[in-house]
């Protein structure tokens, strides 16, 4: 049966025994800035082009053992959530991956900046259709990272990022705090904000909307046919990147403002239990869970 | 995220250094009274001191960025400091990434075209 997260974002008309919007997102390219990925995994083979971009810090610790499947874990799962054949949101989207996070999932602001610059230069050299950039990472507030995101957004690129897993105000983190970026928090199958150990999803006015981010089934780098469940605001952001790809594929001329408006318009409203958030943040945090447009848009989204 | 709201720096640390001295006889001295600012991550364990993103003013050309980077290296060398330019930015933001001692920040902030300097910091998979 359909995984809970795909059912949650799917309009009622499509809640059959499977989720298969034909060719969703085929006009859009999604850039993923993350770890290395297992690009020949059965779930994503032929859908992800691994660019030659790599800018990562050395792994911490003298006894660190670099195991390929672990190095690829985070990025492979997210690529699967965005465009995987069986558990992906936008099954028609093609992706390009840039490695900005090392085998421990750690990167730098500077490496991310150089990655964003690489995307801009690629866009200028070979203009394609709409671009979505997925940034499933977070660091402390960074003026320069936010500025780079602003410039890329002004160049017509849609940026989607994780709100952060610190159970804190997303405005204290980047790129989550960049106003031009679509910042995504995580909810679970009960529409509760996701708890992650002692922490959980970030919140506050810098979050644009929430999306499924707990127990998300996706491609596992443990083997070429494996699946695994992962949780986090990265997984939530990957859902929104997939939804954005489908919306842009159906309406390639959408501006960032129009896309943001549509994401909000089609979201489920007031379903999140706000008691989880600190009292002073409840009114500031959007009570929105991302969803695909309803069946009235069938000709646009499911052609 | 969340458009239409003014930026909030939160705990973000900002160190403003006024540009007073005209030392080193800069050919392109900054306009009188302008200040370049220094920023670093508020979360101490995430800081990466020793690597800095020098962001130049918006309309700065690549050649000017390269010249500014070279000037920084020359002035640092005169003070006995080794520096390494790791990357010159152009396309999104003008500027450069430099590996250098934090002792040189005051000097770097006085360079022409400099808008602000940010210490590098870590980002993490979420």
């Amino acid at each position: 049966s359909i995984p809970w997260n795909l059912e949650r974002i799917t309009p009622p008309r499509y809640r059959a025994d499977e989720y298969q919007p034909p060719d969703g997102g085929s006009l859009v390219e999604v850039y993923l800035l993350d770890t290395s990925i297992q690009s020949d995994h059965r779930e994503i083979e032929g859908r992800v082009m691994v660019t030659d971009f790599e800018n990562v810090p050395e792994e911490d610790g003298t006894r660190f053992h670099r195991q390929a499947s672990k190095c690829d874990s985070h990025g492979t799962h997210l690529a699967g959530v965005v465009s995987g054949r069986d558990a992906g949101v936008a099954k028609g989207a093609s992706m390009r991956s840039l490695r900005v996070l090392n085998c421990q999932g750690k990167g730098t602001v500077s490496g991310t900046l150089i990655g964003l610059e690489f995307i801009r230069k690629s866009q200028l050299v070979q203009p394609v259709g709409p671009l979505v950039v997925l940034l499933p990472l977070a660091g402390g507030y960074s003026r320069v990272l936010n500025a780079a995101c602003q410039r890329l957004a002004r160049a017509g690129v849609v940026l989607v990022t994780a709100a952060g897993n610190f159970r804190d105000d997303a405005c204290l983190y980047s790129p989550a705090s960049a106003p031009e970026v679509i910042t995504v928090g995580a909810t679970n199958a009960q529409d509760q904000p996701v708890t992650l150990g002692t922490l959980g999803t970030n919140f506050g006015r810098c979050v644009d909307l929430f999306a499924p981010g707990e127990d998300i089934i996706g491609a596992s780098s443990d083997c070429s046919t494996c699946f695994v469940s992962q949780s986090g605001t990265s997984q939530a952001a990957a859902h929104v990147a997939g939804i954005a790809a489908m919306m842009l594929s159906a309406e390639p001329e959408l501006t960032l403002a129009e896309l943001r408006q549509r994401l909000i318009h089609f979201s489920a409203k007031d379903v999140i239990n706000e008691a989880w958030f600190p009292e002073d943040q409840r009114v500031l945090t959007p009570n929105l869970v991302a969803a695909l447009p309803p069946s009235t848009h069938e000709n646009l989204y499911f052609q | 995220g969340a458009m239409g709201q003014e930026d909030e720096d939160g705990d973000y640390e900002e160190l403003v250094l006024a540009l007073r001295s005209e030392e080193d006889g800069l050919a392109e001295a900054p306009e009188h009274g302008t200040t370049a600012t220094f920023h670093r991550c508020a979360k101490d364990p995430w800081r990466l001191p020793g690597t800095y993103v020098v962001v130049l003013k918006e309309e700065t050309h690549l050649s000017q960025s390269e010249r500014t980077a070279r000037r920084l290296q020359a002035q640092a060398a005169r003070r006995g400091y080794l520096t390494k330019i790791l990357h010159v930015f152009h396309g999104l933001l003008p500027g450069f990434l430099v590996k250098m001692s934090g002792d040189l920040l005051e000097l770097a902030l006085k360079l022409p075209h400099v808008d602000y300097i940010e210490e590098d910091s870590s980002v993490f998979a979420q």
């Epitope: 499977e18 298969q20 034909p22 297992q38 690009s39 020949d40 059965r42 083979e45 032929g46 992800v48 082009m49 691994v50 390929a68 054949r85 069986d86 099954k91 083997c223 070429s224 046919t225 | -």
Partner: antibody, heavy 115, light 110 residues
Framework: EVQLVQSGAEVKKPGASVKVSCKAS????????ISWVRQAPGQGLEWMGW????????NYAQKLQGRGTMTTDPSTSTAYMELRSLRSDDTAVYYC????????WGQGTTVTVSS | ESALTQPASVSGSPGQSITISCTGT?????????VSWYQQHPGKAPKLMIY???NRPSGVSNRFSGSKSGNTASLTISGLQAEDEADYYC?????????FGGGTKLTVLG
């Protein structure tokens, strides 16, 4: 143009081994593994397994476990399938195909096992 | 894993439509969006005709279409032509491997 070019026909005695090669070109190797499929005379297609150009990982069909080895050499863009302890019922045309999706196929290599 | 079940043969006259079924279980055809169909002429390598249930690779005639309901996938060929005479194989993911159908011989009459 995406192409898979296989090595030539082989005649082997029972108990011997055979190694078939498959040279890939025209696409980004690491985006796809290589599947191996065989077809005995007058029979249907049988999936034997898959091998990665990215990291050399393999996924063998249960029936093949222990008797077959699939490898890749990214430096020459070539995948290999070795079958040991050959029996007469291993007589077949062996195909390589691109990825699990098997959207592009090699021309086939006839392996005859006969005493 | 057992082969998927296909009719051994089907036939039709030029211009007609025919459908070939491919029945599996919830662990293969019913559980994945990845059913493919291959055409094979005698002495030739198989050729991909349909992938991911209903998608056609570029260069394949739109007379070929695929669908799926529950544990059964179907290939429909409309406007039958003499060159369509061939063997047709379905294929599906399983949890860890791939499985083919036994094959269907399509004969174009007359």
């Amino acid at each position: 143009e995406v192409q898979l070019v296989q090595s030539g026909a082989e005649v082997k005695k029972p108990g011997a081994s055979v190694k078939v090669s498959c040279k890939a070109s025209g696409y980004t190797l690491t985006s796809y593994g290589i599947s191996w499929v065989r077809q005995a005379p007058g029979q249907g297609l049988e999936w034997m397994g898959w091998v990665s150009f990215y990291n050399g990982n393999t996924n063998y069909a249960q029936k093949l476990q222990g008797r077959g080895t699939m490898t890749t050499d990214p430096s020459t863009s070539t995948a290999y399938m070795e079958l040991r302890s050959l029996r007469s019922d291993d007589t077949a045309v062996y195909y390589c195909a691109r990825g699990y999706g098997m959207d592009v196929w090699g021309q086939g290599t006839t392996v005859t096992v006969s005493s | 894993e057992s082969a998927l079940t296909q009719p051994a043969s089907v036939s039709g006259s030029p211009g007609q439509s025919i459908t070939i079924s491919c029945t599996g279980t919830s662990s293969d055809v019913g559980g994945y969006n990845s059913v493919s169909w291959y055409q094979q002429h005698p002495g030739k390598a198989p050729k991909l005709m349909i992938y991911e249930v209903s998608n056609r690779p570029s260069g394949v005639s739109n007379r070929f279409s695929g669908s799926k309901s529950g544990n059964t996938a179907s290939l429909t060929i409309s406007g039958l032509q003499a060159e369509d005479e061939a063997d047709y194989y379905c294929n599906s993911y399983t949890s860890t491997s791939m499985v083919f159908g036994g094959g269907t011989k399509l004969t174009v009459l007359g």
